[in-house]
Interface confidence: low
C-alpha cells in the first residue's frame, strides 16, 4: 500500500446493508489519492461506514437520506 494515506479513504467496503434507521448522513469520497470511490455513511452513534456507491442499497440509502434532509450532500 501507499506509504501515507489520507484518513478519509475507504480501504474496504461494507458487505452488508446498513439498516436505514441507523443512518444519519453521508458523504462521497472521490479523492484521486484514495484507492477507490466510496460513500461514507455516518450512523446515529457518529461512527462511519464505508460503502460502494455502485451498490443498489447504497444508492437507495443516499436517496432516503436526501429526502430526509433538504441540505445538499457534497
Amino acid at each position: 500500500g501507499p506509504a501515507s494515506v489520507p484518513t478519509t479513504c475507504c480501504f474496504n467496503l461494507a458487505n452488508r446493508k446498513i439498516p436505514l434507521q441507523r443512518l444519519e448522513s453521508y458523504r462521497r469520497i472521490t479523492s484521486g489519492k484514495c484507492p477507490q470511490k466510496a460513500v461514507i455513511f455516518k450512523t446515529k452513534l457518529a461512527k462511519d461506514i464505508c460503502a460502494d456507491p455502485k451498490k443498489k442499497w447504497v444508492q437507495d440509502s443516499m436517496k432516503y437520506l436526501d429526502q430526509k434532509s433538504p441540505t445538499p450532500k457534497p
Partner: antibody, heavy 120, light 107 residues
Framework: QVQLVESGGGLVQPGGSLRLSCAAS????????MSWVRQAPGKGLEWVSN????????YYADSVKGRFTISRDNSKNTLYLQMNSLRAEDTAVYYC?????????????WGQGTLVTVSS | DIELTQPPSVSVAPGQTARISCSGD??????VYWYQQKPGQAPVLVIY???NRPSGIPERFSGSNSGNTATLTISGTQAEDEADYYC??????????FGGGTKLTVL
Amino acid sequence: QVQLVESGGGLVQPGGSLRLSCAASGFTFRSYGMSWVRQAPGKGLEWVSNIRSDGSYTYYADSVKGRFTISRDNSKNTLYLQMNSLRAEDTAVYYCARFEFTPWTYFDFWGQGTLVTVSS
Amino acid sequence: DIELTQPPSVSVAPGQTARISCSGDNLGKKYVYWYQQKPGQAPVLVIYDDDNRPSGIPERFSGSNSGNTATLTISGTQAEDEADYYCQSYTAQSSASFGGGTKLTVL
C-alpha cells in the same frame, strides 16, 4: 462452513525466512479481506497485517514493516505471509483471520494457528 | 494506534454476572469487538459492533460502548465461560488494535 487452515510454521534461526500459508474454504475467498494476527507464548493478540479482497492494498504493523509481506492467490483460495529477517521476538502462534466491514477491521473467523519459533 | 486497556483478571461465582472493561481515548466513537479464547484454541468472536452477538453465541453475552469505556457482560456466568477475553478496535489506517486481554476465572 468457514475453514481456515494455516501451515508452514516451524523452527528457524534468527535472520532466517519462513513462508506461512492459509488455505480457505467454505466461503467466497475473493470477497473478503484477510489478516494475520500473532500471539507470543503466554501473551496477548497482536495484529500483523491486512490485505484487501482483491490484493491491491496491504497494511502492516510497524513491528514487521519491511520484513514481512502479505499476499494472496484468489485462484487457489490461499493467503500467504512471507517472513524475512526473523527475530526472536517474532516467535508466536500465527493465525490467519477473515475480516469484513470498514473503515474498521474485525475478525469473524480464525484458523487454528501455526507456531513459528525463532531461536538459535 | 488506539491503546486499549483491560484488567488482567476478573473473577466471578457461577451464575453471577461478570463484567470486563476495555478503556481507550474516545472509544465510544469507534466500534468495539470482543473475542473469547480458551487455552490452546483460536479466538472466537463473541460480540461485534459494540453490542451484537454472532449466531451461535449464547444470549448471556452482551456488550456496550460509550465514552471511553466498552464493557463485555456475561450474565449467569457458566464454568465453560472461563477463558481469556480480548477487546479490539481499529484505526483509520485499516489496522487493528487489541487490548491486553482479561483472564476470566469462574470460582
